[in-house]
């Protein structure tokens, strides 16, 4: 029985209680892998996930989070509320920055600016709760007869791609 | 997939610098911040800095503050580790290690590793 | 504060349950990840913000964290599972924005 229980494909399962040995998978119901002896529920997408890839009898669906909210976890396991860019999600809720940090991200923890002065720079553009500062060329450079005719465009930060 | 290789083990003398690089591949580089991490002989893991590849925007821990430089050359992908003025307690395993594309969640990928020598 | 305290070794026989903590002041309020770090290999990220797993870890391994107090449980533990584990903490600070414990080597007994 064993031997032909290995037989049965993806999408079908071993049915010992009828004389055909495999059968394929109920409805709502998947088997990712050959010689299952049961067929897995599939997972369903409902209040804060959307279904981002139905089940098929061979593998499970997948969910997403809904507008306003971020996956977290293997396989989108839980969605988290997205803040505000310029706010970070506390255990308490969402909270503006600090003065000295930023986020531009809707999701993570406020970041402290850039030190330019640590890497030899001065700061061109100050930052925001939004945005990190933008260092420009060392103080030295910045000395009189040393800039140039015409100042850099102050450079905005754009946002990292979330994973 | 992504991928984080750095450079061969080096030997150095007291005083001295060394500069480890850490080529990604897999995702858009520019992206998603890098962080060095390193681990002395029987010690635990400590953190470095990191450095934001789209502005070259670094943090340093305060340890490491005058004596670290992390810079980036974002046509290849890479990013750099400096560290000047070697000791023998600069000994260590240097790692980069990705950021997941914001601040506050754990390192998603890492690098095999840079073993430092610092010797007379 | 920017210490975070484990124990330096915990010891399980083979299918029993290891929990390895992280203490630190007021950590229920910050988000606490944990890697596993074997000998010549790179650290390994098993749980992030306290409890989700990264695709690829075992259900087995899980994480919480209240108070003082961060936990990481491995449940029905394996030879494999014998490494050394760091939590690790970001914060808002310019001079200590990273900052890990000082590891727990899992010891598999038997």
């Known amino acids: 029985l064993q031997d032909l229980c290995s037989n049965c494909p993806a999408g079908t399962f071993c049915d010992n209680n009828r004389s055909q040995i495999c059968s394929p998978c109920p409805p709502n119901s998947f088997s990712s892998a050959g010689g299952q002896r049961t067929c897995d529920i599939c997972r369903q997408c409902k209040g804060v996930f959307k279904t981002r890839k139905e089940c098929s009898s061979t593998s499970n669906a997948e969910c997403d989070c809904i507008s306003g909210y971020h996956c977290l976890g293997a396989e989108c396991s839980m969605c988290e509320q997205d803040c505000k860019q310029g706010q970070e999600l506390t255990k308490k809720g969402c909270k503006d920055c600090c003065f000295g940090t930023f986020n531009d991200q809707k999701r993570g923890i406020c970041r402290p600016w850039t030190n330019c002065s640590l890497d030899g720079k001065s700061v061109l553009v100050n930052g925001t709760k939004e945005r990190d500062v933008v260092c420009g060329p060392s103080p030295a450079d910045l000395s009189p007869g040393a800039s140039s005719a015409t100042p850099p465009a102050p450079a905005r930060e754009p946002g990292h791609s979330p994973q | 997939q992504v991928q984080l290789v750095q450079s061969g083990a080096e030997v150095k003398k007291p005083g001295a610098s060394v500069k480890v690089s850490c080529k990604a591949s897999g995702y858009n580089f520019s992206g998603y911040y890098m962080h060095w991490v390193r681990q002395a002989p029987g010690q635990g893991l400590e953190w470095m800095g990191w450095?934001?590849?789209?502005?070259?925007?670094?943090n340093y821990a305060q340890k490491f503050q005058g004596r670290v430089t992390i810079t980036r050359d974002t046509s290849i992908s890479t990013a750099y580790m400096e560290l000047s003025r070697l000791r023998s307690d600069d000994t260590a395993v240097y790692y980069c290690a990705r950021e997941p594309g914001y601040y506050g969640s754990g390192l998603d990928y890492w690098g095999q590793g840079t073993l430092v020598t610092v010797s007379s | 504060s920017y210490v975070l305290t484990q124990p330096p070794s915990v010891s399980v026989a083979p299918g029993e349950t290891a929990r390895i903590t992280c203490g630190g002041d007021?950590?229920?309020?910050?988000?606490v990840h944990w890697y596993q770090k074997k000998p010549d290999q790179a650290p390994v990220l098993v749980v992030y913000?306290?409890?989700y797993r990264p695709s690829g870890i075992p259900e087995r391994i899980s994480g919480s964290n209240s108070g003082n107090t961060a936990t990481l449980t491995l449940s029905r533990v394996e030879a494999g599972d014998e490494a050394d584990y760091y939590c690790q903490v970001w914060y808002s600070s310019p001079d200590h924005p990273g900052v890990f414990g000082g590891g727990t080597q899992l010891i598999i007994l038997g």
């Open positions: 913000e306290d409890r």
């Open positions: 007021d950590i229920g309020d910050k988000r």
């Open positions: 450095i934001n590849p789209n502005s070259g925007g670094t």
